[in-house]
């Protein structure tokens, strides 16, 4: 037989069916020009010493072979003895190691068998009613195709599916969408309506994420508030990476999960913008305010479940940084200014009450005064901090108040509102004899003592009603008792107590009269 012809003789090797899983497969035969044809196949297994034979049985029932040697592609003309206008059955027999391996056969009419391409270029993936929809442009001059897909997950083998007949400039396929695992898809096409036409090669992998992006398993820590009033949020644990099928490992466009950080600044609710979304890789600096932080995972199908953390406010206070002066027109606060053209947010809330009851006020951008101070004033009528109780005050600053991550904490402190000097007056002052020339004075703690850092000291005043001499005794803010000594028996005294803040002198308590009785000896 001539090598260019199909040989109508018994094949030149004995029959010894191997029954092995390896061997030739994916035989494709098609016309490549007006009078030439090509068959190609793949061989799975060791290729050393393998000889391939393309077998053909004609519609007449006569059978022949082409010897391909070690090649897995063979071309022949319409003069090779194979009828191209009638149906033929073709398969490959590979002779290796004294055994024969056979490919699945294809039955087709060669003249009408066109080499079909798999979907080329961009395959668009979308979600439609809980299924996956793939769409692509039909390869040139190949309208009219049957399309198949195969898909696998990281833990499952290939499964075959059918896309049905296609007859348009764009082709599409509905495929199953997995809820929680990534999938790899490949597509192939063959000529529609041409009995037994060969399938194209499989397309490049299409990598598809699960419908639900994986929930981010991350942990945060927040650093101490720095001198600049900011603290860094750091990621302690990176999100777990999605497991990918074999063909999607390495570069897998389509399966990317993006993690975004959503910051919600809970403090200072009167500012313009309360939330900001950032990429997880870019960890922000935060003020000392309270925040809710959510990590949102999303893929090409949209966002998934998020994980939320609460970052509590930094409660470190600076008792001396804030000056408050109370005048007839109202109250003014002074604090060291941060920089030029700063917007300040002053937030206050009664101590011991829910954070939701915080009130705040936003200043217009202001420059420091000649003393380098920033100020905020309010009138008595405004009602701000008007009740006689302890308030927690925080001042935040920003040169760009519309940018959530550029706020910093200026100070946090406590302030007693209303008429603090009167409200702070100690009550229940009592005097007890202590010795022949001394007494013990006790009083109930001032309301100011409920406000950390506000009560600077108590002052106890003792007045000798005879000589009108007055002595004053400072007492630590944590004490509510003092011993007055050097007193004379039989003399009338009055005692009063007041509570002072750093910027306000308190109001004296009601005078309490007492005397030490003269001791008469028997």
């Amino acid at each position: 037989c001539r090598t260019s012809e199909c040989c109508f003789q018994d094949p030149p090797y004995p029959d010894a069916d191997s029954g092995s899983a390896s061997g030739p497969r994916d035989l494709r035969c098609y016309r490549i020009s007006s009078d030439r044809y090509e068959c190609s196949w793949q061989y799975e297994g060791p290729t050393a010493g393998v000889s391939h034979f393309l077998r053909c049985c004609l519609s007449s029932g006569r059978c022949c072979y082409f010897a391909a040697g070690s090649a897995t592609r063979l071309q022949f003309s319409d003069q090779a003895g194979v009828s191209v206008l009638y149906t033929v059955t073709l398969w490959v027999e590979s002779w290796a190691r004294n055994q024969t391996e056979k490919s699945p056969e294809v039955t087709l009419q060669l003249y009408n068998s066109v080499k079909y391409e798999p979907p080329l270029g961009d395959i668009k993936v979308s979600k439609l009613a809980g299924q996956l929809r793939m769409e692509w442009e039909t390869p040139d001059n190949q309208v009219g195709a049957e399309v198949q897909f195969r898909h696998r997950t990281p833990s499952s083998p290939w499964k075959l599916g059918d896309c049905g007949p296609q007859d348009d400039d764009t082709e599409s396929c509905l495929c199953p969408l997995e809820m929680n695992v990534a999938q790899e898809f490949q597509l192939r096409r063959r000529q529609l309506g041409s009995q037994g036409s060969s399938w194209s090669k499989w397309s490049s992998p299409v990598c598809v994420p699960p419908e639900n992006p994986p929930q981010p398993q991350v942990r945060f820590s927040v650093e101490q508030l720095g001198q600049d009033g900011r603290r860094r949020l750091t990621l302690k644990e990176q999100p777990t990476q999605l497991e990918l099928p074999e063909g999607c490992q390495g570069l897998a466009p389509g399966t990317e999960v993006t993690y975004r950080l959503q910051l919600h600044m809970l403090s200072c609710p009167c500012k313009a913008k309360a939330t900001r979304t950032l990429h997880l890789g870019k960890m922000p600096y935060l003020s000392g305010a309270a925040y809710n932080v959510a990590v949102i995972s999303s893929n090409q199908f949209g966002p998934g479940l998020n994980q939320t953390w609460h970052i509590p406010a930094d409660t470190h206070t600076e008792p001396v940084a804030l000056n408050i002066s109370v005048g007839t027109n109202g109250t003014t606060m002074y604090w060291p200014a941060r920089a030029q053209s700063m917007t300040y947010c002053i937030e206050w809330q009664p101590v011991g009450q829910d954070g939701g009851l915080a009130t705040c006020s936003l200043t217009a951008p202001q420059d420091p005064d000649p003393a380098g101070m920033a100020t905020y004033s309010w009138s008595r009528e405004s009602g701000a901090m008007g009740q006689e109780k302890c308030y927690y005050i925080t001042i935040f600053a920003s040169a760009h108040p519309e940018k959530l991550t550029l706020w910093s904490t200026v100070l946090s402190t406590y302030h007693f509102g209303g008429n603090a000097s009167a409200a702070g007056t100690p009550h229940h002052v009592s005097v007890k004899n202590h010795s022949l020339d001394s007494v013990s004075v006790d009083w109930a703690p001032s309301l100011l003592s409920t406000c950390p850092g506000v009560l600077k000291e108590y002052v106890v005043r003792c007045r000798d009603e005879d000589s009108k001499q007055v002595s004053e005794h400072p007492v630590q803010p944590t004490e509510t008792q003092v011993t007055l000594s050097g007193l004379r028996a039989g003399v009338a005294y009055t005692v009063q107590v007041r509570a002072d803040t750093a910027w306000l002198r308190g109001v004296w308590s009601q005078p309490q009269r007492f005397s030490i009785e003269v001791q008469v000896s028997d």
């Epitope: 094949p11 029954g19 049985c57 029932g61 006569r62 059978c63 056979k102 056969e105």
Partner: nanobody
């Protein structure tokens, strides 16, 4: 060793139908399968053949359009549906397996394994 057992033969009136079945013991999905017949005093002749996957089918001119060969590899069976039977279809029908596929699908000598046959009688 493959064993083939035919069934479904019998007596039928001309113009009637019969369905012959061939059950193989052993895996025959890698073999071409065929049906042959032998009338009394005549040589065994080719009736129909089918390729391994069932994609390729071949028929003798005398039965084309009346007979249909099919196979079910999962069940290891090959069937021959015979319609519009004629008196000249009377014969013993044999199932055969060709493990090699040499130069033709219709040559008796190509086939390696044979069944015992089933009688088909078409009366007028």
């Amino acid at each position: 060793q493959v064993q083939l057992v035919e069934s479904g033969g019998g007596l039928v009136q001309a113009g009637g139908s019969l369905r012959l079945s061939c059950l193989a013991s052993g895996r025959t999905s890698n073999y071409f399968m065929g049906w042959f017949r032998q009338a009394p005093g005549k040589e065994r002749e080719f009736v129909a053949a089918i390729s391994r996957s069932g994609g390729g089918t071949w028929y003798a001119d005398s039965v084309k359009g009346r007979f249909a060969i099919s196979r079910d590899n999962a069940k290891n069976t090959v069937n021959l549906q015979m319609n519009s039977l004629k008196r000249e279809d009377t014969a013993v029908y044999y199932c055969a397996a060709d493990r090699r596929t040499g130069t033709s699908v219709y040559t008796v000598d190509e086939y390696d394994y044979w069944g015992q046959g089933t009688q088909v009688t078409v009366s007028s």
